[in-house]
């Protein structure tokens, strides 16, 4: 039975050219996290494997930095980075937990961070 929940940074916004941290946290479970995948729509951004560490996809290697923790830092943001991002926690024995973050990249300096919320 899957008892865990994923807490994410929720809906966030950032300025074009800036950077943003995508963060998820898995709680309320004793399951072992074997791997965390970060994806944008159907594109793989990065993987953090419990045994092998961080792996950044080739197409994002110049703009994505691992961390902090199991989070992901996106750099040199463009308007095209606007969209949904998913943290996918692969755990044993529970299975897979997925969290969603919506990022809006703004042209001007009106960007501000959204509230945190939970996805069961």
């Amino acid at each position: 039975m899957m008892t865990g929940t994923i807490e994410t940074t929720g809906n966030i916004s950032a300025e074009k050219g800036g950077s943003i941290i995508l963060q998820c946290h898995l709680s309320s479970t004793t399951a072992q996290v074997t791997q965390v995948n970060w994806e944008q729509q159907d594109q793989l951004l990065a993987i953090c494997n419990a045994d092998l560490g961080w792996h950044i996809s080739p197409s994002f290697k110049d703009r994505v930095a691992p961390g902090p923790g199991l989070g992901l830092t996106l750099q040199s943001l463009t308007v095209n980075d606007t969209g949904e991002y998913f943290c996918i926690y692969h755990t044993y024995p529970d299975g897979t937990y997925t969290g969603r973050i919506f990022l809006e990249v703004l042209e001007s300096s009106v960007a501000e961070h959204g509230a945190r919320f939970q996805i069961p």
């Epitope: 074997t34 791997q35 793989l44 951004l45 990065a46 993987i47 494997n49 045994d51 092998l52 560490g53 792996h55 950044i56 996809s57 080739p58 197409s59 290697k61 692969h90 044993y92």
Partner: antibody, heavy 123, light 109 residues
Framework: QVQLQESGPGLVKPSQTLSLTCTAS??????????WGWIRQPPGKGLEWIGS???????YYNPSLKSRVTISVDTSKNQFSLKLSSVTAADTAVYYC???????????????WGQGTMVTVSS | EIVLTQSPGTLSLSPGERATLSCRAS???????LAWYQQKPGQAPRLLIY???SRATGIPDRFSGSGSGTDFTLTISRLEPEDFAVYYC??????????FGGGTKVEIK
Amino acid sequence: QVQLQESGPGLVKPSQTLSLTCTASGGSIESGLYYWGWIRQPPGKGLEWIGSIYYSGSTYYNPSLKSRVTISVDTSKNQFSLKLSSVTAADTAVYYCARDGVLALNKRSFDIWGQGTMVTVSS
Amino acid sequence: EIVLTQSPGTLSLSPGERATLSCRASQSVSSSYLAWYQQKPGQAPRLLIYGASSRATGIPDRFSGSGSGTDFTLTISRLEPEDFAVYYCQQHTVRPPLTFGGGTKVEIK
């Protein structure tokens, strides 16, 4: 679909270094999801994993061979290579390169293989 | 390391018969990390099954995998002439390192 092809000397002298290269065609080894591995098979025996490498150069090795093994990658040539030092007759085997799905989790396996190349260690 | 013991070493059967191959691990293996391969003489191994029970692309449905923990099975429901080969199981953990079983030869009776 990626295809893999091993190349290198078929004969190596004892105490020397065995060097093999695997060239990928039909696809790039710059993949976010896959490592690229080496497996060997002595004549008439079973399979032994040697080690694997990610496009960025991250590696993981079989501990029993780690002290003698170096695996490297050259993304500009779409190749990865194996070096095995201080070889003996026991290293005589068919050497295969393969795509390693270790990051694919529920699909962990070697799903694409080269045809293999026979390497004999003899003086 | 995790030792995979395959049995029997050799299986003598006729075309059309059912083949049941066993792979036993020295310690528990996640079913997600268990694969089966077929190897014919002079050829590279070919992936048949990953995740203990999922068929790889292009593999006929007469091949099926099952099991969990320390006991895994590859079943060939009706042997075709091209199925006579050596079969290997493999576990794909990182720590302890990945290993292959010693193989089962399926030969024509």
